[in-house]
């Protein structure tokens, strides 16, 4: 039951995380105008991965897409790539994990197959979360660098009468959404990996049992050792004796009322 809960919770947490990564990638507020130096500005600038926007005090907002690919900074391209890879891996992970969920029965899928799928989706979620965190962190680092560069420029060449206030950008809401979402996806992935360990049939059950037939022939069907690798287990070829050493999840190998929560 604990494994099912861990797997289910891991799935839900990852789902929220990936939704957040998608939201962050689409958001326009990756960087927002720093108003510290000019709090009275009537024009507010903010930028995303795909377009930059200007909101006037009238409420009128004008957004312009980055219609060039080659003219964009390499770092921005890298951030885009990381976020897209994160989304793609997360989406595939979600698809795999749906079929891996213990509470969902698909044909005669074995526990070991579900364990493999759970582990695969878990790893995908971890990588997805790391991609998102890396993407957001690279962008944040880029902002910090540009912020201090523009601050340095702001106080040079001001000998004349005319002041030119350079627009500086600071962290936008999308960065925080991305960090949280990436973290959730990572946590969900770890939970899936933990759940995978509980789902895999225990190796020791088979290795510890030795048989000494006394008189009558004991019904023994070979094939149980396949499970020791964790791949290609055949639960149809189960030993009649297994020393009673079953895990909590093996007890629920067959459909019961608990499987359809």
């Amino acid at each position: 039951m604990a494994v099912t809960a861990c797997q289910g919770l891991g799935f839900v947490v990852s789902l929220i995380g990936i939704a957040g990564i998608i939201a962050a990638t689409c958001m326009d507020q990756w960087s927002t105008q720093d108003l510290y130096n000019n709090p009275v500005t009537a024009v507010f600038n903010y930028q995303g991965l795909w377009r930059s926007c200007v909101r006037e005090s009238s409420g009128f907002t004008e957004c312009r897409g980055y219609f060039t690919l080659l003219g964009l900074p390499a770092m921005l391209q890298a951030v885009r790539a990381l976020m897209i890879v994160g989304i793609v891996l997360g989406a595939i992970g979600l698809l795999v994990s749906i079929f891996a969920l213990k509470c969902i029965r698909i044909g005669s899928m074995e526990d070991s197959a579900k364990a493999n799928m759970t582990l695969t989706s878990g790893i995908m979620f971890i990588v997805s979360g790391l991609c998102a965190i890396a993407g957001v962190s690279v962008f944040a680092n880029m902002l910090v660098t540009n912020f201090w560069m523009s601050t340095a420029n702001m106080y040079t060449g001001m000998g004349g009468m005319v002041q030119t206030v350079q627009t500086r950008y600071t962290f936008g809401a999308a960065l925080f959404v991305g960090w949280v979402a990436g973290g959730l996806t990572l946590i969900g992935g770890v939970m899936m990996c933990i759940a995978c360990r509980g789902l895999a049939p225990e190796e020791t059950n088979y290795k510890a049992v030795s048989y000494h037939a006394s008189g009558h022939s004991v019904a023994y069907k070979p094939g149980g050792f396949k499970a020791s690798t964790g791949f290609g287990s055949n639960t149809k070829n189960k030993k009649i004796y297994d020393g009673g050493a079953r895990t909590e999840d093996e007890v629920q190998s067959y459909p019961s009322k608990h499987d359809y929560v």
Epitope: V40, A42, N45, Y46, V54, S58, F60, Q166, T167
Partner: antibody, heavy 119, light 113 residues
Framework: QVQLVQSGAEVKKPGASVKVSCKAS????????MHWVRQAPGQGLEWMGM????????NYAQKFQGRVTMTRDTSTSTVYMELSSLRSEDTAVYYC????????????WGQGTTVTVSS | DIQMTQSPSSLSASVGDRVTITCRSS????????????LTWYQQKPGKAPKLLIY???TRESGVPSRFSGSGSGTDFTLTISSLQPEDFATYYC?????????FGGGTKLEIK
């Protein structure tokens, strides 16, 4: 068509308050900022502040902070500008102007309200 | 506050003349986010409310004759009337639309020579 109709001329004594109204029609009242601009006799234009009729949020020029209050009544599509502690230099024509949607500039102006401050 | 300085304060010209009014701001009105200059030009006739002519430094308001044009960037702007018409004799104001308070220039009174 868009119309901004302001209240009539006022004569006030120094230290008193004046409340000028501006009734809007011909457009969605709650969608546009309303500005107040004044013009002293023979002088230039002076921006006083603005109010958003939907949220009621205001932005006043530092010069008028503490003396000016802008309010709105959405049921009658009217905005009000109240100026307190009147001085003789507050004698001016007060205009309300609708915020232009697409740029920051006001594009429709009221006919103006003459406020005379005299003892 | 941004100071707006208009020159000349008054100008005499004849019908058909080409007229240029300049406006200088104490701070740049160019927004880097969209590369637009937040400067507006108004025309005011005696006893009337101001009328919007040009916004974003060079965008003509609908219904404004093509003889009116705006140019400039950053801190220096100009309003040009290519061929003066009798109805163009009025006072012209530039306005900072970039930061609060939205300050106006002192005005340029255009009179008939």
């Amino acid at each position: 068509q868009v119309q901004l109709v302001q209240s009539g001329a006022e004569v006030k004594k120094p230290g008193a308050s004046v409340k000028v109204s501006c009734k809007a029609s011909g457009y969605t009242f709650t969608s546009y900022w309303m500005h107040w601009v004044r013009q002293a006799p023979g002088q230039g234009l002076e921006w006083m502040g603005m109010i958003h009729p939907n949220s009621g949020s205001t932005n006043y020029a530092q010069k008028f902070q503490g003396r000016v209050t802008m309010t709105r009544d959405t049921s009658t599509s009217t905005v009000y500008m109240e100026l307190s502690s009147l001085r003789s230099e507050d004698t001016a024509v007060y205009y309300c102007a609708r915020r232009y949607y697409g740029s920051i500039s006001p594009d429709y102006w009221g006919q103006g309200t003459t406020v005379t401050v005299s003892s | 506050d941004i100071q707006m300085t208009q020159s000349p304060s008054s100008l005499s010209a004849s019908v058909g003349d080409r007229v240029t009014i300049t406006c200088r701001s104490s701070q740049s009105l160019l927004n880097s986010g969209n590369q637009k200059n937040y400067l507006t030009w108004y025309q005011q006739k005696p006893g009337k409310a101001p009328k919007l002519l040009i916004y974003w430094a060079s965008t003509r308001e609908s219904g404004v004759p093509s003889r009116f044009s705006g140019s400039g960037s950053g801190t220096d702007f100009t309003l040009t009337i290519s061929s003066l018409q009798p109805e163009d004799f009025a006072t012209y104001y530039c306005q900072n639309d970039y930061s609060y308070p939205f300050t106006f220039g002192g005005g340029t009174k255009l009179e008939i020579k």
